[in-house]
């Protein structure tokens, strides 16, 4: 089958500081040297790009400076971290992988990771 399978966890719970991490793993049908990873958020049938990074195999992922994502790569596995999440950001986060170079191009889209974000309770006023 000339397709690329992408695996990611079904559910992740963000930390109380609004940070969520998950692994995106892809089964590469070719020997890519350049890979692009995009995180998409799907909510109410609307799709938005959360962040994207292109990296050379063996090198680190480089997201834009103002990106809410960071990540590291190891072989065909990408460890993604999304920061600054709030309860309203709860949704399905989909990992999309593209083998950019050399040809042929391959596209792989994961089933998505449902990220649950719970805003921390405000600290009660202290009498001390």
């Amino acid at each position: 089958c000339k397709a690329m399978h992408v695996a990611q966890p079904a559910v992740v719970l963000a930390s109380s500081r609004g940070i969520a991490s998950f692994v995106c793993e892809y089964a590469s049908p070719g020997k890519a040297t350049e890979v692009r990873v995009t995180v998409l958020r799907q909510a109410d049938s609307q799709v938005t790009e959360v962040c994207a990074a292109t990296y050379m195999m063996g090198n680190e992922l480089t997201f834009l400076d103002d990106s809410i994502c960071t990540g590291t790569s190891s072989g065909n596995q990408v460890n993604l971290t999304i920061q600054g999440l709030r309860a309203m950001d709860t949704g399905l986060y989909i990992c999309k992988v593209e083998l950019m170079y050399p040809p042929p191009y391959y596209l792989g889209i994961g089933n998505g990771t449902q990220i649950y974000v719970i805003d921390p309770e405000p600290c009660p006023d202290s009498d001390f």
Partner: antibody, heavy 118, light 108 residues
Framework: QVQLVESGGGVVQPGRSLRLSCAAS????????IHWVRQAPGKGLEWVAV????????HYADSVKGRFTISRDNSKNTLYLQMNSLRAEDTAVYYC???????????WGQGTLVTVSS | EIVLTQSPGTLSLSPGERATLSCRAS???????LAWYQQKPGQAPRLLIY???SRATGIPDRFSGSGSGTDFTLTISRLEPEDFAVYYC?????????FGQGTKVEIK
């Protein structure tokens, strides 16, 4: 709203060159791969070329490799197709199309006709 | 290169009838990466179905897609006058991007 508008088509002699343009609006141009697809008169759709995101990566159909060059100017939201050494079999309507996040081509231009004839 | 073969070449039907269009791939295609387009004379193609079975924005529910592996189907449950057109399948999981040769749905 998303719009793609092609221009630059016309009649050209075999062996000559032509440059097509595709002006995009209504979306973040640099976040999408953009393709050229052509359709010979009365025939089906044939993929021609694609250029990705920042413009560094490109892929071509074997039928145009070495003759056609795809490029983009993200500051102008414009896609180009430089067509050299044109042949009669390159006669077609040329469409630019946006590849959406999931992979299919969700928006197409109206097309521009290229006729290669002596 | 994945070759897509559509059948039949032409389908002659009346409004209100059901249309079943077939697309067969030369090798297995992930259903996530199979699309259907509609094209009317003098117009650009329009995306109908992606991921083999998901309807694109604004596409009426009389259009449905199904299939996996090498065999895919586009079904139009009840043909409306505006549905008479040429339909193309496409795979977009790997380069080169390929289209079927098209099926023309014409009025009987």
């Amino acid at each position: 709203q998303v719009q793609l508008v092609e221009s630059g088509g016309g009649v050209v002699q075999p062996g000559r060159s032509l440059r097509l343009s595709c002006a995009a609006s209504g979306f973040t141009f640099s976040s999408y791969g953009i393709h050229w697809v052509r359709q010979a008169p009365g025939k089906g759709l044939e993929w021609v070329a694609v250029i990705w995101y920042d413009g560094r990566n490109k892929h071509y159909a074997d039928s145009v490799k070495g003759r056609f060059t795809i490029s983009r100017d993200n500051s102008k939201n414009t896609l180009y197709l430089q067509m050299n050494s044109l042949r009669a079999e390159d006669t077609a309507v040329y469409y630019c199309a946006r590849q959406d996040y999931w992979g299919p081509f969700d928006y197409w231009g109206q097309g521009t006709l290229v006729t290669v004839s002596s | 290169e994945i070759v897509l073969t559509q059948s039949p070449g032409t389908l002659s039907l009346s409004p209100g009838e059901r249309a079943t269009l077939s697309c067969r791939a030369s090798q297995s295609v992930s259903s996530s990466y199979l699309a259907w387009y509609q094209q009317k004379p003098g117009q650009a193609p329009r995306l109908l179905i992606y991921g083999a079975s998901s309807r694109a924005t604004g596409i009426p529910d009389r259009f449905s897609g199904s299939g996996s592996g090498t065999d895919f189907t586009l079904t139009i449950s009840r043909l409306e006058p505006e549905d008479f057109a040429v339909y193309y399948c496409q795979q977009y999981g790997s380069s080169p991007w390929t289209f079927g040769q098209g099926t023309k749905v014409e009025i009987k």
